[in-house]
């Protein structure tokens, strides 16, 4: 069975979060997709969404967020550039499927942004150049406002029994700590 999990990314200010959410290609290829932040005790807030219908491999930029939907592969790429400490939080990808409730994708992203110089060798900050080289479509977030009242917004259980950390030999540059935490089984 698929587990809804969190993956934790610890990055420095100025760096880029570069993640992907996968979806069932046959069902959702052209569906509108969105990137949301989940704050404790609040409804998820949509920060950016793709066009409707979603266009293949067509970057959409909303502020510092760039979404790119690879229809052919069932992948939504999300980049948050020039990260700020206040960007820290829990994020998720969803697929809008009106009139039904949004379909939540795996996995959730727990982003922790800390202050500090990010220009160390191998830092991800150079990735920020990449997102501007093809002028993305800048759109206003014309996204449906409804969100699922059933979305779990409380913190995941603190149990360590179900937590798996990256293998010790893995060197994920500046993604210093990625931890999978099941939200529920």
């Amino acid at each position: 069975a698929t587990k809804l999990t969190e993956e934790k990314y610890e990055l420095k200010e100025g760096q880029t979060l570069d993640v992907k959410c996968d979806y069932t290609l046959e069902k959702f290829a052209s569906s509108q997709k969105a990137w949301q932040i989940i704050r404790d005790g609040e409804m998820p807030k949509t920060l950016a969404c793709t066009e409707r219908p979603s266009k293949n491999s067509h970057p959409v930029q909303v502020g510092r967020i760039i979404l790119e939907d690879y229809h052919d592969h069932g992948l939504l790429r999300v980049r948050m550039v020039n990260l700020q400490v206040e960007d820290s939080g829990l994020y998720q990808c969803v697929i809008y499927q009106p009139p039904k409730e949004p379909h939540m994708l795996f996995d959730r992203i727990r982003l922790v942004v800390t202050k500090g110089f990010s220009g160390t060798p191998g830092s991800n900050e150079n990735s920020t150049q990449n997102v501007y080289k093809i002028p993305p479509t800048t759109t206003k977030a014309l996204c449906p406002l409804y969100t699922s009242p059933r979305t779990v917004t409380q913190a995941p259980p603190k149990s360590t029994a179900d937590v798996s950390t990256p293998d010790s030999e893995i060197n994920l540059t500046n993604v210093t700590d990625i931890i999978r935490v099941p939200v529920f089984n």
């Epitope: 992948l75 990449n130 798996s164």
Partner: antibody
């Protein structure tokens, strides 16, 4: 340590299908995408596609889309790649590969490779 | 799709030589580039990721540099065990593509 052990060599006739398995050990199978890369004899490397063992979702390049199926059995930490309607030009070594980062990272660095499975298509 | 062009396609060098291989992308790929080594009959091995980061356990004589469209892979002092084919690979977007490879031989 991380290990990907693939099934043995196969000889198939044109038009047939082949299913290659890839058994993972040494890490949490559902935490990392499995990709498939092939290499025809004396040729370069060709990315075929990916699969997320947690969600079961997968994607493949246009060239293979109608012929490839990527599946998994999480109970035995095994990924499968099935290629149908085989032709002689599909004769190649097929590799399963694990990425450097967790499934959510857009970081397509192929860190751990299986030993490869030679598939020969010949009438 | 992004095309990756490696040069030279083959080269011969002596033990101790400095060896350089280049990889050119058909468009800007920032630093989304990896380098692999493949010895005959073996699976490829990741050496460098994100253009310049050395994978854990890889000898420091291997290095990578570049960004945008032009990248360089260098072996500072060639060793007999470095005989292999080397590939670059981009992941700026989907689909992922590899260079055609550079075959390295000892003189």
């Amino acid at each position: 340590q991380v290990q990907l052990v693939q099934s043995g060599a196969e000889v198939k006739k044109p038009g047939a299908s082949v299913k290659v398995s890839c058994k993972a050990s040494g890490y949490t199978f559902t935490s990392y995408d499995i990709n498939w890369v092939r290499q025809a004899t004396g040729q370069g490397l060709e990315w075929m596609g990916w699969m997320n063992p947690n969600s079961g979702n997968s994607g493949s390049v246009k060239k293979f889309r109608d012929r490839v199926t990527m599946t998994r059995d999480t109970s035995i930490s095994t990924a499968y790649m099935e290629l149908s309607s085989l032709r002689s030009e599909d004769t190649a070594v097929y590799y399963c590969v694990r990425l450097i980062g967790y499934s959510s990272a857009f970081k397509w660095s192929f860190q751990h490779w299986g030993q490869g499975t030679l598939v020969t298509v010949s009438s | 799709d992004i095309q990756m062009t490696q040069s030279p396609s083959s080269l011969s060098a002596s033990v101790g030589d400095r060896v350089t291989i280049t990889c050119q992308a058909s468009r800007d790929i920032s630093k989304y580039l990896n380098w692999y080594q493949q010895k005959p009959g073996k699976a490829p091995k990741l050496l460098i990721y994100d253009a310049s980061n050395l994978e854990t356990g890889v000898p420091s004589r291997f290095s990578g540099s570049g960004s945008g469209t032009d990248f360089t892979f260098t072996i500072s002092s060639l060793q007999p065990e470095d005989i292999a084919t080397y590939y670059c690979q981009h992941y700026d977007n989907i689909p992922i593509t590899f260079g055609q490879g550079t075959r390295l031989e000892i003189k």
